[in-house]
Interface confidence: medium
């Protein structure tokens, strides 16, 4: 899972201003995993604030691992954060709010919520439990905050920011509720 629509402020021991991340896993230590393959991968370094190369063992590890420099930059660098913040400031819905409900191909039948662009409201649907798309929320409130006009209680950018004084995350999400499941 990745925590979408929630920003993490990383305070590092550098002269740079606090680093804002849209995904907490961008702060995970690079983890080569328990296997012994030699695979070139990329991770986001919270200290240099750049995507860098590392050697991955081929299994295990964590989500701060990308097949290309471009993918790493797209997910973890400031340009991406600015784009998402700009979207929020303009009170525009993220693109994925306009995706159709997608149960995926599995047969788990889990209750989830999606934004219905016809009714302009968040509605319940049955999710199969795998694949699907990002218009898929665990709670009605999450869906409303993300996709409905007016954004639910509080809404807006204030809900995005959550400061945490951390160094490297050790590979698991920070200790607070996670938001929205990100499926490809």
């Amino acid at each position: 899972d990745s925590e979408e629509d929630e920003e993490y402020t990383i305070i590092t021991d550098t002269e740079l201003p606090p680093l804002k991340l849209m995904h907490s896993f961008c702060a995970f230590k690079p983890d080569d995993g328990p296997c012994k393959a030699i695979m070139k991968r990329f991770f986001f370094n919270i200290f240099t604030r750049q995507c860098e190369e590392f050697i991955y063992g081929g299994c295990g590890g964590n989500q701060n691992r990308f097949e290309s420099m471009e993918e790493c930059k797209k997910v973890c660098t400031r340009d991406n954060v600015n784009r998402i913040i700009q979207t929020a400031l303009q009170k525009e819905k993220p693109d994925f709010c306009f995706l159709e409900e997608d149960p995926g191909i599995c047969r788990g039948y889990i209750t989830r919520y999606f934004y219905n662009n016809q009714s302009k409201q968040c509605e319940r649907f049955k999710y199969g439990g795998c694949l699907g798309n990002m218009n898929n929320f665990e709670t009605l409130e999450e869906c409303k905050n993300t996709c409905e006009d007016g954004g639910g209680s509080g809404g807006g950018l204030n809900d995005i920011f959550e400061a945490q004084k951390i160094e490297w995350h050790e590979g698991g999400p920070p200790h607070h509720h996670h938001h929205h499941h990100h499926h490809h």
Partner: antibody
């Protein structure tokens, strides 16, 4: 009796294209998501792509994203895989399979061999 | 390297019980996603053996059983028979950044004769 029959495999040069087909019978084709799974010679199984019953949702493994396109024609009970920019590492037997219970592939075709070589 | 880890090979004598393990992580088996098992006889397509962790499709003998606990799963075969000699694959879903259906590397089961 459920039957899945793949066709369209063959020898192609790196950078080339190929279109695989899978003819389905013995079940209500439009009610089932379908997948392509491949197996390189002497290796294990690798999921390639999947498509929902209606064809409205498609999914791809990272290794083929942007190069392969899955589609279906429910009026012809046929599943397709358009493969472009083929690489040597795409050499494999390609199976089509239908997604039934849970995340499982209930039935598989016999496979069609794709060889990418110059 | 496969996302799910299986032993490359196992062997057993006819009549014996063998267990094939499948180890995953917190983003697949540990995230409560079902595991499936497939049998692939030499030169043939895979065949579904177990779905939803421990369910057998019709026609699969009850000598085959599956289980899942935490980040691991296993396939047990009792009363081993010569025709059980095959490759066995576990399969699940992985919800990591590029979510996809994932397989184990396969286990070659040899029935000693």
């Amino acid at each position: 009796e459920v039957q899945l029959v793949e066709s369209g495999g063959g020898l192609v040069q790196p950078g080339g294209s190929l279109r695989l087909s899978c003819a389905a019978s013995g079940f209500t084709f439009s009610s089932y998501a379908m997948s392509w799974v491949r197996q390189a010679p002497g290796k294990g199984l690798e999921w390639v792509s999947a498509i929902s019953g209606s064809g409205g949702s498609t999914y791809y493994a990272d290794s083929v994203k942007g190069r392969f396109t899955i589609s279906r024609d429910n009026s012809k009970n046929t599943l397709y895989l358009q493969m472009n920019s083929l690489r040597a590492e795409d050499t494999a037997v390609y199976y089509c399979a239908n997604n039934g219970a849970a995340a499982a592939w209930d039935y598989w075709g016999q496979g069609t061999l794709v060889t990418v070589s110059s | 390297q496969s996302v799910l880890t299986q032993p490359p090979s196992l062997s057993g004598a006819p009549g014996q019980r063998v267990t094939i393990s499948c180890t995953g992580s917190s983003s697949n088996l540990g995230a409560d996603y079902d595991v499936q098992w497939y049998q692939q006889l030499p030169g043939t397509a895979p065949k579904l053996l177990i779905f939803g962790n421990n369910n057998r499709p019709s026609g699969v003998p009850d000598r085959f059983s599956g289980s899942r606990s935490g980040t691991s799963a296993s396939l047990a075969i009792t009363g081993l028979q010569a025709e059980d000699e095959a490759n066995y694959y576990c399969q699940s879903y992985d919800r990591s950044l590029s979510g996809s259906m994932v397989f184990g590397g396969g286990t070659k089961l040899t029935v000693l004769g």
